[in-house]
Amino acid sequence: TTELTEEKYEYKEGQTLEVKCDYALEKYANSRKAWQKMEGKMPKILAKTERPSENSHPVQVGRITLEDYPDHGLLQVRMTNLQVEDSGLYQCVIYQHPKESHVLFNPICLVVTKGSSGTPGSSENSTQNVYRTPSTTAKALGPRYTSPRTVTQAPPESTVVVSTPGSEINLTNVTDIIRVPVFN
């Protein structure tokens, strides 16, 4: 088994966490993906994609947006307007059933602290060089989401996943499992 190594990421309140989660294209392109937070030893599903996964059709749950790119083998997660209480351990997973999920390596240990200065969302963690192109030709800084699918917050689901390093389930080949990148 491969040991899960947590990666610590520090943000200020109001900033946006962007995560790029790679996955094996041939195996998981049509699978549902989910973003979950560990609460104790039980993961809580915060958002999950539709099935079959639609290319670049955002799924939005509150401040969380999931955008799956099955043509590219990549799931993008955005958590906007981060708050101190968002701090915790997060994972991208291939969501197959509430009791069975393929877990990412390198879970994200998110630490959100009170911002001391600057406007919310503006910092070294902000996305650079991005132009937002609405229906007009005007361009402004910052990403934009087109026609997000808003999902009413449902009662949290849980996946039974052992979070102890080295004891993850369904690891048949490490190249099949997506890895956690954090885009900051």
Epitope: D22, S56, Q128, T133, T175, R179, V180, P181, V182, N184
Partner: antibody
């Protein structure tokens, strides 16, 4: 089979302009991020620009920001790179690439030579 | 920007031997790392993404590993078609950046 065919390369004087085009086939163009990557003669690879499917996100490397413009026409399965205020250091083979973060499929490239 | 450094610049290996290439990032890129192969006069080809996931059609003798700032690319038994230049690339942060390349040549 994915095919990306670049056109529009050639010789241009410093300060001049050139528009590269890329004809895409063999995949759902409108579902894919696209990028331009260049390679100066005898040198390594340099990313230039990336564009989301619907054009809502566009990223540039600092060295071409304000001079180069990436655009796409999903109805025609085409990607473009408008290059203005060209400099000698822009001389390179320009590749049209499927993908926005990593580069999954490449065209054969279009040579752009900036010289007086 | 994140600077990617590859080593060695040139690697001389005999056919059938193992080739191990290194890539180091100036700051953590998690596992947002890809490897490409470029043969002389040809366009590059994606081999590995997500640090260890093989792209479509890439043989099992090719593998990648690492996370954070240190990455390794391995060809377990070099074939004639493997002699080429290899590049690593990070896609955690904009701008996307690539290493300077490692040339794998016949010993």
């Amino acid at each position: 089979e994915v095919q990306l065919v670049e056109s529009g390369g050639g010789l241009v004087q410093p300060g001049g302009s050139l528009r590269l085009s890329c004809a895409a086939s063999g995949f759902t163009f409108s579902s894919n991020w696209m990028s331009w990557v260049r390679q100066a003669p005898g040198k390594g690879l340099d990313w230039m620009a990336s564009m989301k499917q619907d054009g809502s996100e566009i990223y540039y490397v600092d060295s071409v920001k304000g001079r180069f413009t990436i655009s796409r026409d999903n109805a025609k399965n085409s990607l473009h790179l408008q290059m203005n205020s060209l400099r000698a250091e822009d001389t390179a083979v320009y590749y049209c690439v499927r993908g926005g973060w990593r580069f999954e499929s490449w065209g054969q490239g279009a040579l752009v030579t900036v010289s007086s | 920007e994140i600077v990617m450094t590859q080593s060695p610049a040139t690697l001389s290996v005999s056919p059938g031997e193992r080739a191990t290439l290194s890539c180091r990032a100036s700051q953590s890129v998690s596992s947002n790392l890809a490897w490409y192969q470029q043969k002389s006069g040809q366009a590059p080809r994606l081999l590995i993404y997500g640090a260890s996931i093989r792209a479509t059609g890439i043989p099992a003798r090719v593998s990648g590993s690492g996370s954070g700032t240190e990455f390794t690319f391995t060809i377990s038994s070099l074939q004639s078609e493997d002699f080429a230049v290899y590049y690593c690339q990070q896609y955690k942060n904009w701008p996307l950046t690539l290493g300077g390349g490692t040339k794998v040549e016949i010993k």
